[in-house]
């Protein structure tokens, strides 16, 4: 005999909504390894800057990617698949996933809020590695979603820090077309967005990670809810 | 051993057209922009126009813009330059060039082919 | 008229130092873009000399160095030999005119 009533509705919200989670992970581990595996990307693992290889920090932002999505799909199957199924054991290893999946969201938090600084520098080397991979390697489609992505985004294009082969290639084909580069290339500059993202604007990300925190434990209060209704109606 | 070698140069009248070419070796020519630059009797280098690897990205400085055509054929090692509605300021040793990223420069260069406008 | 200004002529005796300057503006030279210099000895295609204001490709002698400061770039060559009589150019990317651009030339003449 199944949930009735109220508890229906809940396996069904929890039912569409790690649909949703699952999709959307879905999208990104798929994005992720379209980037990781594009053909014109894998020839370009380590990237040359001046007569040196550059750490790859495209790579490591991209594998990150990789692992948010799995785990994105994983969680949201359990959940779906849980909610549907009526089983408590699914639906048990689905809170303590979430359960865990917050802890890493406080302790990522906490990291993110001491070593911002760091982090910021790394998203400014992920945005000049895609960049020169999207000029050095012109079909690179992939390079090129990416830096489109930042530009449209960040609402910039380009930094002070370009070749002035970048600087041609952004001002002939790369920027936005409300973009400022064409009058005045850095008055637009990726990397002072980036910076003022990661100060000025913190907020915007706190905001961010306390909604997700927010629907986490909207999950876990409904996941355990799901649970309770299933065993009490095994009982009768 | 990087070689450039132009040819295509020669007498032209006002308003004609040529094609210079540009037998590049020694190197992987599909992995690297390529230019043309050009020098005027008694005046200075002048860059003139550049073309990506794979040909998606090119541009031409404002002198030469609808009128001149860069191309190039990675099969064949070859790099073109379409010269169009030709006028006596076109006058010049025309140069093939390759483009370095990592130094950002025009890192080795042909012996040049010459191009005579003239009536 | 160049971009970049060069004096017409340069010249010195055999085992002298002569400097080459070059002269830009804050959208190329002093934008950050690198200042490159290139020789072109008679009869031959111009050579990379010196790259990114003070670096030497690999085969070119340590007697010529290259320096930057503000809007101008120079040239140094030191113990000056015959073989280094040609001319010299130096080169940078101009932001405003979306161009690279050169120095009108600099003619070295080794005396002597």
């Known amino acids: 005999m199944g949930v009735e009533g109220c508890t229906k509705c809940i396996k069904y919200l929890l039912f569409v909504f790690n649909f949703v989670f699952w999709l959307a992970g879905g999208v990104i581990l798929g994005v992720a390894l379209w980037l990781r595996h594009d053909p014109q990307t894998t020839n370009l693992l380590y990237l040359e800057l001046g007569d040196k290889p550059a750490p790859n920090t495209f790579y490591v932002g991209i594998y990150i990617l990789i692992a948010v999505g799995a785990v994105m799909m994983f969680v949201g199957f359990l959940g779906c698949y849980g909610a549907i199924q009526e089983s408590q054991c699914l639906l048990g290893t689905f809170f303590t996933c979430l359960v865990i999946l917050f802890a890493c969201e406080v302790a990522a938090g906490i990291w993110g809020f001491v070593n911002k600084d760091q982090i910021a520098k790394d998203v400014k080397q992920f945005y000049d590695q895609a960049l020169q991979q999207a000029v050095v390697d012109d079909d690179a489609n992939n390079a090129k979603a990416v830096v489109k992505t930042f530009h449209e985004t960040l609402d910039c294009c380009g930094s002070s820090t370009l070749t002035a082969l970048t600087t041609s290639v952004l001002k002939n084909n790369a920027c936005p077309s409300g973009s400022n580069i064409i009058s005045n290339l850095f008055k637009e500059d990726c990397h002072q967005k980036i910076d003022d993202l990661f100060s000025g604007k913190l907020y915007l990300i706190g905001i961010a990670a306390i909604v997700v925190a927010v629907i986490m434990i909207f999950e876990m209060i409904l996941s355990m809810v799901l649970c309770c209704g299933i065993r009490n109606s095994s009982v009768y | 051993e990087v070689q450039l070698l132009e040819s295509g140069g020669g007498l032209v009248q006002p308003g004609g057209s040529l094609r210079l070419s540009c037998a590049a070796s020694?190197?992987?020519?599909?992995?690297?922009?390529m230019s043309w630059v050009r020098q005027a009797p008694g005046k200075g280098l002048e860059w003139v126009s550049y073309?990506?690897?794979?040909?998606?990205?090119?541009d031409y400085a404002d002198s030469v813009k609808g009128r001149f055509t860069i191309s190039r054929d990675n099969s064949k090692n070859t790099l073109y330059l379409q010269m169009n509605s030709l006028r006596a300021e076109d006058t010049a040793v025309y140069y093939c060039?390759?483009?370095?990223?990592?130094?950002?420069?025009?890192?080795?260069w042909g012996q040049g082919t010459l191009v005579t406008v003239s009536s | 008229q160049s971009v970049l200004t060069q004096p017409p002529s340069a010249s010195g005796t055999p085992g002298q130092r002569v400097t080459i300057s070059c002269t830009g503006s804050?959208?190329?030279?002093?934008?950050?873009?690198?200042t490159h210099w290139y020789q072109r000895l008679p009869g031959t295609a111009p050579k990379l000399l010196i790259y990114?204001?003070?670096n030497r490709p690999s085969g070119v002698p340590d007697r010529f160095s290259g320096s930057k400061s503000g809007t101008s770039a120079s040239l140094a060559i030191s113990g000056l030999r015959s073989e280094d009589e040609a001319d010299y150019y130096c080169?940078?990317?101009?932001?405003?005119?979306?161009?690279?651009?050169f120095g009108g030339g600099t003619k070295l003449t080794v005396l002597g």
């Open positions: 990114g204001n003070s």
């Open positions: 080169q940078s990317y101009d932001t405003n005119l979306s161009v690279w651009v």
């Open positions: 020694g190197f992987t020519f599909s992995s690297n922009y």
């Open positions: 060039a390759r483009y370095s990223y990592s130094r950002d420069n025009f890192d080795y």
């Open positions: 804050t959208s190329n030279i002093g934008a950050g873009y690198g």
């Open positions: 073309i990506s690897s794979s040909s998606t990205y090119t």
